[in-house]
């Protein structure tokens, strides 16, 4: 019968010939009367056999990631008779792994959107690296993820590549962040190879800004001949949020005379001061009213940023018109 152990050859061996093992018949008494032959893919080019001893050698550098095993056939012939001593047998040479591949992030570029002011622990995105080395061979393909850039706002789970928020972020201070993640094989031990990827994290807006008047005092004038419904001027508040979070409503907070009204121009987000009742210079030549501004809609959890509505004082001077 045939006698051999399992055959392994390390990949990327630089020697011109590397002894893999021996293949022999148990009828071989060592007097060089038998001839061993190798057949199959790789025989003669990648692997050779010593015809007398049955020793097998790799004569080419191998790459496990290209081909991880070779199936060959062995023959043994009695030189004197030319007959087969054993039936032809199939055997396997396995290419064993070395850590010659760095982790690669295949889904680049990564981009994620997360709401500003999200609490610590909020999941942002998961990044995944692949390592072409053999996952069953030691730690060659066991990866650990770490953060190279992005502290203190982000953290990455070492074994999963899940990126989470580690500190609240405010879109109005910075609206996007570049995070750099490194994946290291060999679970970070000496000899590890690494790859990096960048993640663009954009903050989406939440309603964490209340509108605030540009001026604390406005001066307007109205002619005593102005009919009711006349627009006598505009007031303006700032809201640094965007989109619907910046939509605002103006209203009168104080107007003892009940002479004026304020409507909101939702296109320009300005407040328009309107004459509600006709004015008479001889009766009253100036008015003081207070206007306030609020966001259209504020979710309950964001009310702490909207505790008191901004107000402004409007001084309105009535212009005299000569009366017949």
């Amino acid at each position: 019968g045939w006698v051999w152990n399992q055959f392994f050859v390390p990949e990327e061996m630089n020697t011109t010939s590397h002894h893999i093992g021996q293949l022999r018949s148990d009828l071989d008494n060592g007097n060089n009367s038998f001839q061993y032959k190798l057949l199959g893919a790789g025989a003669g080019s990648t692997f050779i056999i010593d015809e007398r001893t049955g020793d097998i050698y790799a004569i080419q550098k191998l790459d496990r990631e290209e081909r991880s095993l070779y199936i060959l056939r062995a023959q043994v012939i009695d030189i004197a008779t030319g007959r087969a001593v054993e039936p032809e047998s199939e055997f396997v040479i396995k290419v064993s792994d070395i850590n010659d591949n760095e982790p690669k992030f295949l889904d680049e570029p990564y981009e994620a959107i997360v709401p500003e002011m999200s609490p610590e622990g909020t999941l942002v995105i998961q990044v995944t690296a692949s390592d072409a080395d053999d996952p069953s061979s030691g730690n060659n393909a066991r990866l650990l993820y770490s953060l190279l850039q992005g502290q203190p706002y982000f953290s990455v789970e070492p074994t999963t590549g899940v990126i989470r928020i580690s500190s609240k972020m405010d879109r109005e201070l910075q609206d996007e962040y570049w995070v750099i993640i490194q994946a290291k094989d060999m679970i970070g031990q000496p000899g590890a190879l690494s790859g990096t990827t960048s993640v663009l994290i954009k903050l989406s807006d939440v309603n964490d800004n209340k509108p605030i008047f540009k001026e604390s005092l406005y001066r307007l004038t109205v002619s005593e001949s102005a009919p009711t419904g006349t627009s006598i001027g505009t007031i303006m508040a700032y809201d640094n949020d965007i989109g619907e979070n910046a939509e605002m409503d103006y209203s009168i907070e104080e107007d003892d005379s009940q002479t004026f009204d304020i409507i909101t121009n939702h296109e320009t987000q300005e407040g328009i001061v309107i004459l509600k009742k006709k004015v008479d210079f001889e009766h009253q030549n100036h008015y003081g009213i207070r206007a306030k501004v609020k966001n259209h809609h504020v979710p309950e959890q964001l009310m702490k940023y909207h505790t008191e509505a901004s107000t402004t004082f409007i001084k309105i001077q009535v212009e005299d018109v000569d009366e017949p």
């Epitope: 879109r171 109005e172 604390s216 640094n240 901004s310």
Partner: antibody, heavy 125, light 106 residues
Framework: QVQLVESGGGVVQPGRSLRLSCAAS????????IHWVRQAPGKGLEWVAV????????YYADSVKGRFTISRDNSKNTLYLQMNSLRAEDSAVYYC??????????????????WGQGTTVTVSS | SYELTQPPSVSVSPGQTASITCSGD??????VSWYQQKPGQSPILVIY???KWPSGIPERFSGSNSGNTATLTISGTQAMDEADYYC?????????FGGGTKLTVL
């Protein structure tokens, strides 16, 4: 790292002029408004002036209006304060400070998040 | 012009809670920032927009703002918190600082 460094301070006689500079590094200078704030010896902070990120708007404290001019050169990452007609009460440590907030935001709700180490101006005869 | 008023000094024992107030007309309608300044050093922003923390500031510092008064609260006060504290607000395109409060940790 993010840094602001003031220079140009010194001793000057009343009525004379002085120009302060503030060199920025470690951040995109052209995206931020910058303030000048001063502090007289043993006194509190007093706001002096602000310039928007693109130089389009400038505002001044009443105490310096008409005498001081704030300007910036974004190509040189530098802020300036030209101080004319100096008075004894202008003696102080002058700080430049970055206005927190991205371009497009307005107002000064987010504070001043980066400050220089200050440069001392002494107005004395 | 708009004015912000702070008490000149506040004292607190280590581990206790310190409260520093800042008052101004209808201040609750505005947003307030707070700065810490130690002797010979530049100011540091510790609270902005009434109650938000800049990166790196411990949550022992907190802020509130209502009516005519904003308050900076330091819980579990430490010796290293001894400093001058300034409130700051914005009014009609100008910036206003309070006069400052010296916090002494006894």
């Amino acid at each position: 790292q993010v840094q602001l460094v003031e220079s140009g301070g010194g001793v000057v006689q009343p009525g004379r002029s002085l120009r302060l500079s503030c060199a920025a590094s470690g951040f995109t200078f052209s995206r931020y408004g910058i303030h000048w704030v001063r502090q007289a010896p043993g006194k509190g902070l007093e706001w002096v002036a602000v310039i928007w990120y693109d130089g389009s708007n400038k505002y001044y404290a009443d105490s310096v209006k008409g005498r001081f001019t704030i300007s910036r050169d974004n190509s040189k990452n530098t802020l300036y304060l030209q101080m004319n007609s100096l008075r004894a009460e202008d003696s102080a440590v002058y700080y430049c400070a970055r206005r927190a907030g991205i371009p497009g935001t307005t107002g000064y709700y987010y504070g001043m998040d980066v400050w220089g180490q200050g440069t001392t101006v002494t107005v004395s005869s | 012009s708009y004015e912000l008023t702070q008490p000149p000094s506040v004292s607190v024992s280590p581990g206790q809670t310190a409260s520093i107030t800042c008052s101004g007309d209808r201040l609750g309608e505005k947003y307030v920032s707070w700065y810490q300044q130690k002797p010979g050093q530049s100011p540091i922003l510790v609270i902005y927009q009434d109650n938000k923390w800049p990166s790196g500031i411990p949550e022992r510092f907190s802020g509130s703002n209502s009516g005519n008064t904003a308050t900076l609260t330091i819980s579990g006060t430490q010796a290293m918190d001894e400093a001058d504290y300034y409130c700051q607000a914005w009014d009609s395109s100008t910036v206003v600082f309070g006069g400052g409060t010296k916090l002494t940790v006894l």
